[in-house]
Interface confidence: low
C-alpha cells in the first residue's frame, strides 16, 4: 500500500492510526478504508489533540523526515467546482465520512478562492518546533495529489477508526504478556483503550519458560453502553507473587490469602464488578446520570444528586444535559463572532487581521507592504481588500489576476499600430520601415527615404545605436536576429501591410536593425517577435511585402 | 554517536552568577529541544529549564524561574544556563540532556552528559 | 503540578529474581511516561519510553507497561550490572516531573 501503521491512539470510542507514506489524499483515504475508517477529522480542539498525540508517537526519535515542515492528510476535502465559502470555519470544504460543517478549525493561513480544482487538507508540522497541547497542528490546503507519483504526495496520512465502545486493557496479576488485535488490524501490547470487537492474546509466564499458559478474549457488548472482555479475576496470578505484581491486576485492593492466593477487592463506597477486577462507584452519580458534559454533583448524605454544566454552557429542560450558550448574542466581536462549544472566537474578515483596540477588533491587512504584495508589479492596498496593476504596455493576467503580461501591440485588437514594420518588445513597441522608406517623426508612418537598399529600421544594435536609418547595405540570406544588449534575441519585425508600393526589391541579407527615427532615447529589450517570411526576394499573394528572419533557436513563427 | 559535555560549574557565593555551558555532537542539534535537569547531592532528579530546537519557547521550573535563563547556539551546537541570584538550594550536579522527540514537548530525555557539579557556598 | 510517586524506596533482591517497581502519577498521564536507570556518580540512561517501549541498546530484561495513573518497571531477571537507582518521569505537561527513585540493592 506504501504506508505502514506506526502508530495508535485510542480514546473516547474512536482509534486515530498514523501513517508515514508518500501517498495521494484518495490513495490515503483508500488505505484507511480499507480497514472500515476514513481519513481522521479533526472536530474540536480535543480531537486535534488526539491526532497531534498519534502523530508525536509516529515521529518520535530519528524520523526519517529530515524536512523542516512535514505535511499529513486528514479527511478534509472540497470537490472541484464547489467554491470557497469564507463564512463558515470549514471554508466550504467538507469532512470525507459526512457530518456537520463544525465549528472548530485551524486554518495555517488564509484561503484563496479557486473552484476549478478539487482541493485537500493535511495537517502542517513544524519540526522545528516542538508539540503543545496549545499548539496544535495547523491545517494547509492544497492539490490532492497524485496516485503513483510520489513526488506530488505529501509525506503521510492519519486514519480514524470509530466504535461503539471500548473496552478497558487488561490488568495481569503475574508475569505475562497481552497482545491485542484491532478490527482495523493493528496489533499492540499497549493501549490505553481497547475497541470493541478487539481480540487479546495473553501469554502468561515468564517468557523463557515452557509453562506459558495462553488466553484469548474478545471485546464484547455485555449490555448497553458496556463493554468488556467476559474474563472473570486476575489474569496470569502466580502464587510466587501474590499481590506484589501489578497490584495482582486489581483496580483498587488486593487480598492476599496464606497459600499464595488473592482476590480483588473495592474501598468503602465502591463495589466490585463481574469480571472481579475491576471496581465501580456505588453512589447515584457512578451511573452518569448527567450528560453532555455536565459534572454529576452528590446531594447531601450521597442520597441523591444534581446535574452542573461548565462555564459558557447552561443545563437544558431535562436538568441532565448541557446546552451551548450562546454569546455571539451579545455582539461581542468587531466583525464576525463564531459560537463554539462552551465559548466563542472572534474572527477577521477576509482581508483584515486581529488588532486594533478593544477586544475582538480587526484591522487591515496591508497586502501590499513590503515583501508580502501578490501583486508581479502595482499593488494597491484598500480597505479589506487590494488590487493590482501593470505599468504601461501590460496587461493584468493569471487566473487570479496578480500576473502581467505584455501586450503584443504589434497584434492588438485594433490592428497594427504601425504603419510598416513592427517591434514588439517587453511592456512597449517600434516601428520601423521597409528599404528606401525611413520613418516619419510620428514615429508610425514612412516616408520616401534615400534612394538606397538597406535594411528595414528597428531597435538599435549593441554597436549601431544612433546609425542613420538604411547607412549600411545586406550581404547575406535569412541569417539570425542579432543580440541585444543584455544578451538576449533582439525583436525581429512583424509585417504589417505598408503604405507605399511593395515594388521595391528585397535582397537577402542580414537584419541589422537600426533604431528608427522617434525610438526613446531609453533601450527596453524586446522579446522575440518572428515575422512569417519567405527566405528569398519575392512578392507573397496578396501583395504584403515580408521580411526574411530566422530564430537562433530553429523555431520560427511563435514569440 | 551523541554525545553531550557540560561545563562551567564551580563554587559560587549565594547572590552569584554562573553560566553552564554543554557541548553537543553526533546529532542534528537544531532539530532537538534540550533540557537542564539537576540532581541535588543525596536526591532525586529535579527538571529544571528547555529550550526548543529553534530557541524561539523556553520553559523553566516555578523553582528558577527570573533567575535562571537558557539559550542556545544552533551554528557552535551548544546549549547554555545562565544562572543568577544564586542560593544554597541550587547547589547541585546539572545534567545537559537531549529530548527524545523532535516534536513533542515536553518528552522523555533519550541522552544525557555527565554533569557539571554546581556549588552555592559562602 | 503532576506529583509522581514509587513504590518501593528501596528493595532487596538477588541475581535472577524478578523485580517490579511500580509508579503512580497523581492524575492520568496517557502512555506519558519514562523510566531511568541510573548508577552512583553517573548521569541517567533512559531505559523505556512511551510507558512501555524499550529503548535502543537496553537489554529486554526491562519491560514496562501500564496507562493513565499506574506504570510498572520489571526486570525479568535481575543481573548484577542491574543494581541502580531508578527513576519513573512523566512527560504528559510541563514541568516533567520525576519518581523519587527506587534503589535496587544487593540481597
Known amino acids: 500500500t506504501g504506508a505502514d501503521t506506526e502508530a495508535v491512539v485510542c480514546v473516547g470510542t474512536a482509534c486515530y492510526t498514523a501513517h508515514s507514506g508518500k501517498l495521494s489524499a484518495a490513495e490515503a483515504q483508500n488505505h484507511c478504508n480499507q480497514n472500515g475508517g476514513n481519513l481522521a477529522t479533526v472536530k474540536s480542539k480535543e480531537e486535534a489533540q488526539h491526532v497531534q498525540r498519534v502523530l508525536a508517537q509516529l515521529l518520535r526519535r530519528e524520523a526519517a523526515l529530515t524536512a523542516r515542515m512535514s505535511k499529513f492528510w486528514i479527511g478534509l476535502q472540497r470537490e472541484k467546482g464547489k467554491c470557497l465559502d469564507p463564512s463558515l470555519p470549514l471554508k466550504g470544504f467538507s469532512w470525507v465520512g459526512g457530518g456537520e460543517d463544525t465549528p472548530y478549525s485551524n486554518w495555517h493561513k488564509e484561503l484563496r478562492n479557486s473552484c476549478i480544482s478539487k482541493r485537500c487538507v493535511s495537517l502542517l508540522l513544524d519540526l522545528s518546533q516542538p508539540l503543545l497541547p496549545s499548539r496544535l497542528p495547523k491545517w494547509s490546503e492544497g492539490p490532492c495529489g497524485s496516485p503513483g507519483s510520489p513526488g506530488s504526495n505529501i509525506e503521510g496520512f492519519v486514519c480514524k477508526f470509530s466504535f461503539k465502545g471500548m473496552c478497558r486493557p487488561l490488568a495481569l496479576g503475574g508475569p505475562g504478556q497481552v497482545t491485542y488485535t484491532t478490527p482495523f488490524q493493528t496489533t499492540s501490547s499497549s493501549l490505553e483503550a481497547v475497541p470493541f470487537a478487539s481480540a487479546a492474546n495473553v501469554a502468561c509466564g515468564e517468557g523463557d519458560k515452557d509453562e506459558t499458559q495462553s488466553h484469548y478474549f474478545l471485546c464484547k457488548e455485555k449490555a448497553p453502553d458496556v463493554f468488556d472482555w467476559g474474563s472473570s479475576g486476575p489474569l496470569c496470578v502466580s502464587p510466587k507473587y501474590g499481590c506484589n505484581f501489578n497490584n495482582g491486576g486489581c483496580h483498587q485492593d488486593c487480598f492476599e490469602g496464606g497459600d499464595g492466593s488473592f482476590l480483588c477487592g473495592c474501598r468503602p463506597g465502591f463495589r466490585l464488578l463481574d469480571d472481579l477486577v475491576t471496581c465501580a462507584s456505588r453512589n447515584p452519580c457512578s451511573s452518569s446520570p448527567c450528560r453532555g458534559g455536565a459534572t454529576c454533583v452528590l446531594g447531601p448524605h450521597g442520597k441523591n444528586y444534581t446535574c452542573r454544566c461548565p462555564q459558557g454552557y447552561q443545563l437544558d429542560s431535562s436538568q441532565l444535559d448541557c446546552v451551548d450558550v450562546d454569546e455571539c448574542q451579545d455582539s461581542p466581536c468587531a466583525q464576525e463572532c463564531v459560537n463554539t462549544p462552551g465559548g466563542f472566537r472572534c474572527e477577521c474578515w477576509v482581508g483584515y487581521e486581529p488588532g486594533g483596540p478593544g477586544e475582538g477588533a480587526c484591522q487591515d491587512v496591508d497586502e501590499c507592504a513590503l515583501g508580502r504584495s501578490p501583486c508581479a508589479q502595482g499593488c494597491t492596498n484598500t480597505d479589506g481588500s487590494f488590487h493590482c496593476s501593470c505599468e504601461e504596455g501590460y496587461v493584468l493576467a493569471g487566473e487570479d489576476g496578480t500576473q502581467c503580461q505584455d501586450v503584443d501591440e504589434c497584434v492588438g485588437p485594433g490592428g497594427p499600430l504601425c504603419d510598416s514594420l513592427c517591434f514588439n518588445t517587453q511592456g512597449s513597441f517600434h516601428c520601423g520601415c521597409l528599404p528606401g522608406w525611413v520613418l516619419a517623426p510620428n514615429g508610425v508612418s514612412c516616408t520616401m527615404g534615400p534612394v538606397s537598399l538597406g535594411p528595414p529600421s528597428g531597435p538599435p544594435d549593441e554597436e549601431d545605436k544612433g546609425e542613420k536609418e538604411g547607412s549600411t547595405v545586406p550581404r547575406a540570406a535569412t541569417a539570425s536576429p542579432t543580440r541585444g544588449p543584455e544578451g538576449t534575441p533582439k525583436a525581429t519585425p512583424t509585417t504589417s501591410r505598408p503604405s507605399l508600393s511593395s515594388d521595391a526589391p528585397i535582397t537577402s541579407a542580414p537584419l541589422k536593425m537600426l533604431a528608427p527615427s522617434g525610438s526613446p532615447g531609453v533601450w527596453r529589450e524586446p522579446s522575440i517577435h518572428h515575422a512569417t517570411a519567405a527566405s528569398g526576394p519575392q512578392e507573397p499573394a496578396g501583395g504584403d511585402s515580408s521580411v526574411a528572419t530566422q530564430n537562433n533557436d530553429g523555431t520560427d513563427g511563435q514569440k | 554517536e551523541v554525545q553531550l559535555v557540560e561545563s562551567g560549574g564551580g563554587l559560587v557565593q549565594p547572590g552569584g552568577s554562573l553560566r553552564l555551558s554543554c557541548a553537543a555532537s553526533?546529532?542534528?542539534?537544531?532539530?532537538?529541544?534540550m533540557s537542564w535537569v539537576r540532581q541535588a547531592p543525596g536526591k532525586g532528579l529535579e527538571w529544571v529549564s528547555a529550550?526548543?530546537?529553534?530557541?524561539?519557547?523556553?520553559y523553566y521550573a516555578d523553582s528558577v524561574k527570573g533567575r535562571f535563563t537558557i539559550s542556545r547556539d544552533n551554528s557552535k551546537n551548544t546549549l547554555y544556563l545562565q544562572m543568577n541570584s544564586l542560593r544554597a538550594e541550587d547547589t547541585a550536579v546539572y545534567y545537559c540532556a537531549r529530548d527524545g522527540s523532535r516534536i513533542y514537548f515536553p518528552d522523555d530525555l533519550d541522552y544525557w552528559g555527565q554533569g557539571t557539579l554546581v556549588t552555592v557556598s559562602s | 503540578d503532576i506529583q509522581m510517586t514509587q513504590s518501593p524506596s528501596s528493595l532487596s533482591a538477588s541475581v535472577g529474581d524478578r523485580v517490579t517497581i511500580t509508579c503512580r502519577a497523581s492524575q492520568g498521564i496517557s502512555s506519558y511516561l519514562a523510566w531511568y536507570q541510573q548508577k552512583p556518580g553517573k548521569a541517567p540512561k533512559l531505559l523505556i519510553y512511551a510507558a512501555s517501549s524499550l529503548q535502543s541498546g537496553v537489554p529486554s530484561r526491562f519491560s514496562g507497561s501500564g496507562s493513565g495513573t499506574d506504570f510498572t518497571l520489571t526486570i525479568s531477571s535481575l543481573q548484577p550490572e542491574d543494581f541502580a537507582t531508578y527513576y519513573c518521569q512523566q512527560h504528559y505537561t510541563t514541568p516533567p516531573t520525576f519518581g523519587q527513585g527506587t534503589k535496587v540493592e544487593i540481597k
Open positions: 553526533g546529532f542534528t542539534f537544531s532539530s532537538y529541544a
Open positions: 529550550i526548543s530546537g529553534s530557541g524561539g519557547s523556553t
